[in-house]
């Protein structure tokens, strides 16, 4: 089952500005840009063995996340 | 996603090496394509990137001498490096990371640059 | 920059032994509840393959074998059972701001 985007809030860093539901917070430059500029994932297929922890970084709301949290969707944005 | 570098083995001292990656199944308008370098038997070293909106990053130790330019319609990009002396020799590769992580995923086979006269 | 210190330089090893190599860096790496840190996997005449990002996150095709682990500033890139085709040599990376930074490599050899 495909999610959308969950969001990523700092431990050690203040929230970026909060992006839309279109937008991915791109850390490079640190503001939000449309999602399909970055190289966002895609589905793995059924079976893959390995966890596909990807998800769209966009810290409008604080979800808790652990470092590279093994549950975390894959973006619903591609 | 497959990315395939090209460009001449041998550079002369003082010239400009100039190398190519040719990127097939991404569109280089998304994502950030970078270059790393790897010396003969030593490690690697970031030298930069050129992001999906044409902005670019060069690593500070090498700014002064580093061009990392696109063509979209071939959907390659280039590294030109002026004035290199024999510390330049190295295996130059072309990369692009994950998102949100950032991670270089895919890579190409790299290229050898031999500098010397 | 951040600067990646690797240890070992380079070990020797059995097949199926467990090898764990580490990796510190010079400040934090860990941003918006990631840890930006990634291990390769580096052969002879080949370019770099992604073992793990995220700290502990398996790259694709990975074996299962192979996990990493950390925060912060230290990290560990564990082998469970060394396995011929484990002989290489492992970097760390972080890739939280640039320049992206290497450590200076981690070189298993068979013993």
């Known amino acids: 089952m495909r999610r959308g985007p969950r969001s990523l809030r700092g431990r050690d860093a203040p929230a970026p500005t909060p992006c839309v539901p279109a937008e991915c917070f791109d850390l490079l430059v640190r503001h939000c840009v449309a999602c399909g500029l970055l190289r966002t994932p895609r589905p793995k297929p059924a079976g893959a063995s390995s966890p596909a922890p990807r998800t769209a970084l966009q810290p409008q709301e604080s979800v808790g996340a652990g470092a590279g949290e093994a549950a975390l969707p894959l973006p619903g944005l591609l | 996603v497959q990315l395939q570098e090209s460009g001449p083995g041998l550079v002369k001292p003082s010239e400009t090496l100039s190398l190519t990656c040719s990127v097939s199944g991404d569109s280089i308008t998304s994502g950030y394509w970078n270059w790393i370098r790897q010396p003969p038997g030593k490690g690697l070293e970031y030298i930069g990137y050129?992001?999906?909106?044409?902005?670019?990053y060069y690593n500070p130790s090498l700014k002064s001498r580093v061009t990392i330019s696109r063509d979209t319609s071939k959907n390659q990009y280039s590294l030109r490096l002026s004035s290199v002396t024999a510390a330049d020799t190295a295996l130059y590769y072309c990369a692009s990371p994950n998102y949100p992580f950032y991670a270089m995923d895919y890579w190409g086979q790299g290229t050898r640059v031999t500098v010397s006269s | 920059d951040i600067v990646m210190t690797q240890s070992p330089s380079s070990l020797s090893a059995s097949v199926g032994d467990r090898v764990t190599i580490t990796c510190r860096a010079s400040?934090?790496?860990?941003?918006?509840?990631?840890?930006?840190m990634n291990w390769f996997q580096q052969k002879p005449g080949k370019a770099p393959k992604l073992l793990i990002y995220a700290a502990s996150n398996l790259g694709s095709g990975v074996p299962s074998r192979f996990s990493g682990s950390g925060s912060g500033t230290d990290f560990t890139l564990t082998i469970s059972s060394l396995q011929p085709e484990d002989f290489a040599t492992y970097y760390c990376?972080?890739?939280?701001?640039?320049?992206?930074?290497f450590g200076q490599g981690t070189k298993v050899e068979i013993k």
């Open positions: 050129i992001s999906y909106s044409g902005s670019t």
């Open positions: 990376q972080q890739s939280k701001e640039v320049p992206w930074t």
């Open positions: 400040e934090s790496v860990d941003n918006y509840g990631i840890s930006f």
